[in-house]
C-alpha cells in the first residue's frame, strides 16, 4: 500500500486572456472508477476551492456550469484549465485528487503550481 | 465560525438503535467530506466512518461497517450516524470532524457520550 | 491497515521543559499525509500540524513537527501549563483512517 503521488509543474505564465493551464497527473495504486479532482488556491496559509469535478474512469471531467475551470482526463492524467484570472489572482495553485471508488480511499495533493497572471496594459487612445 | 454540534446520544440497551446527528455551520457543507470518529472511556480515537460530498460515496471501519449508516443532508447541512444492533463495545464519545482541503481533520464537535447497557 | 505506535505511554516533564514525542508508522506514509493532535481532558481533539510540519491556523510557534517514511516527530519547545494533555497522531493519506493510541505530557 503506497501513498498516491500527485505531480504539477511549479510554474505557470497565464496568458493576456487570464487563462492559465496545466497538466495534474497522479500515481494511482488502485484501480479507481470514481475520481474527484480540485483545484486549491494557497495564500498566506489560507486555503481556498477554486473548482471541483468528479469523473468516472473513461468518461470526460464535467465541472459545474458557473465554474471557472474547464478539464479533460485521459487516463491518469487531467488537463486543467483556469480562466478569467487577474494579477490579484496570481498565486499557488494545489491539485488533489481523491480516488473515491471502489475502496480503499486514496488522496493525492501536488505541491502547487505557482500561477502568475499579468493584467495586460490598457490599449492607448490612437487619434485618427 | 465553523462549528459543528453533535446530538442525539444516551443510554441505550444492546441490540437496539440509536440516530446521532451533527449540525454544521460556517463553511459550505457540501465542499468537504465529514467523518464520525469515537472515544471509548479513557481509550484513544477511533476512526468510525466518514462520507463524501454528496453523500453517494462513504467509508466504514470493519468494527461498524453493516451495523452503521452515514448520510448527510446537504440542504439542512446535516450529518448523520445511524446505529443498529448497538453492543457494550460502542459505549463511546462521538465527535463529528470536518475533513479540511488539505485532508487532515480540521474541525471537530464538542463530542457527545453514547452509552450501550442492559 | 497502517498501524501507528507512539512512544512514550506517558511523558514527565515540567513546564519550560522540551518535549519530544514519537509516532512509529508500520508502513512508510507519505510525509503530506499525518498530523498531529491535542487533547485536553474534558475536551475534543484539536488538530496542531498537518502534512507533518505545517502548524494549523492559531497553534504557537512552539509546537513543530518532522520526520518522514516511518518515523515521525512531534516537538514543544518549551512546555507552557495548557500544553499538558494527551496527543494523538494520524495518518489520512489512505482508508481507513488510523490514528496512534496516544502520548500523555503530564506534570512531573
Known amino acids: 500500500c503506497k501513498a498516491m503521488h500527485v505531480a504539477q509543474p511549479a510554474v505557470v505564465l497565464a496568458s493576456s486572456r487570464g487563462i492559465a493551464s496545466f497538466v495534474c497527473e497522479y500515481a494511482s495504486p488502485g484501480k479507481a472508477t470514481e475520481v474527484r479532482v480540485t483545484v486549491l488556491r494557497q495564500a498566506d496559509s489560507q486555503v481556498t476551492e477554486v473548482c471541483a469535478a468528479t469523473y468516472m474512469m473513461g468518461n470526460e471531467l464535467t465541472f459545474l456550469d458557473d465554474s471557472i475551470c474547464t478539464g479533460t482526463s485521459s487516463g491518469n492524467q487531467v488537463n486543467l484549465t483556469i480562466q478569467g484570472l487577474r494579477a490579484m489572482d496570481t498565486g499557488l495553485y494545489i491539485c488533489k485528487v481523491e480516488l473515491m471508488y471502489p475502496p480503499p480511499y486514496y488522496l493525492g495533493i501536488g505541491n502547487g503550481t505557482q500561477i502568475y497572471v499579468i493584467d495586460p496594459e490598457p490599449c492607448p487612445d490612437s487619434d485618427f | 465560525q465553523v462549528q459543528l454540534v453533535e446530538s442525539g446520544g444516551g443510554v441505550v440497551q444492546p441490540g437496539r438503535s440509536l440516530r446521532l446527528s451533527c449540525a454544521a455551520s460556517?463553511?459550505?457543507?457540501?465542499?468537504?467530506?465529514i467523518h464520525w470518529v469515537r472515544q471509548a472511556p479513557g481509550k484513544g480515537l477511533e476512526w468510525v466512518a466518514v462520507i463524501w460530498y454528496d453523500g453517494r460515496n462513504k467509508h466504514y471501519a470493519d468494527s461498524v461497517e453493516g451495523r452503521f449508516t452515514i448520510t448527510r443532508d446537504n440542504s439542512n447541512n446535516t450529518l448523520y450516524l445511524q446505529m443498529n444492533s448497538l453492543r457494550a463495545e460502542d459505549t463511546a464519545v462521538y465527535y463529528c470532524a470536518r475533513q479540511g482541503y488539505m485532508g487532515s481533520l480540521d474541525y471537530w464537535g464538542q463530542g457527545i457520550l453514547v452509552t450501550v447497557s442492559s | 491497515e497502517i498501524v501507528l505506535t507512539q512512544s512514550p505511554g506517558t511523558l514527565s516533564l515540567s513546564p519550560g521543559e522540551r518535549a519530544t514525542l514519537s509516532c512509529r508508522a508500520s508502513q512508510s506514509v507519505s510525509s503530506s499525509y499525518l498530523a498531529w493532535y491535542q487533547q485536553r481532558p474534558g475536551q475534543a481533539p484539536r488538530l496542531l500540524i498537518y502534512g507533518a510540519s505545517s502548524r494549523a491556523t492559531g497553534i504557537p510557534d512552539r509546537f513543530s513537527g518532522s520526520g518522514s517514511g516511518t518515523d515521525f516527530t512531534l516537538t514543544i519547545s518549551r512546555l507552557e501549563p495548557e500544553d499538558f494533555a494527551v496527543y494523538y497522531c494520524?495518518?489520512?493519506?489512505?482508508?481507513?483512517?488510523?490514528f496512534g493510541q496516544g502520548t500523555k505530557v503530564e506534570i512531573k
Open positions: 460556517g463553511f459550505t457543507f457540501s465542499n468537504f467530506g
Open positions: 494520524q495518518q489520512y493519506g489512505r482508508s481507513p483512517w488510523t
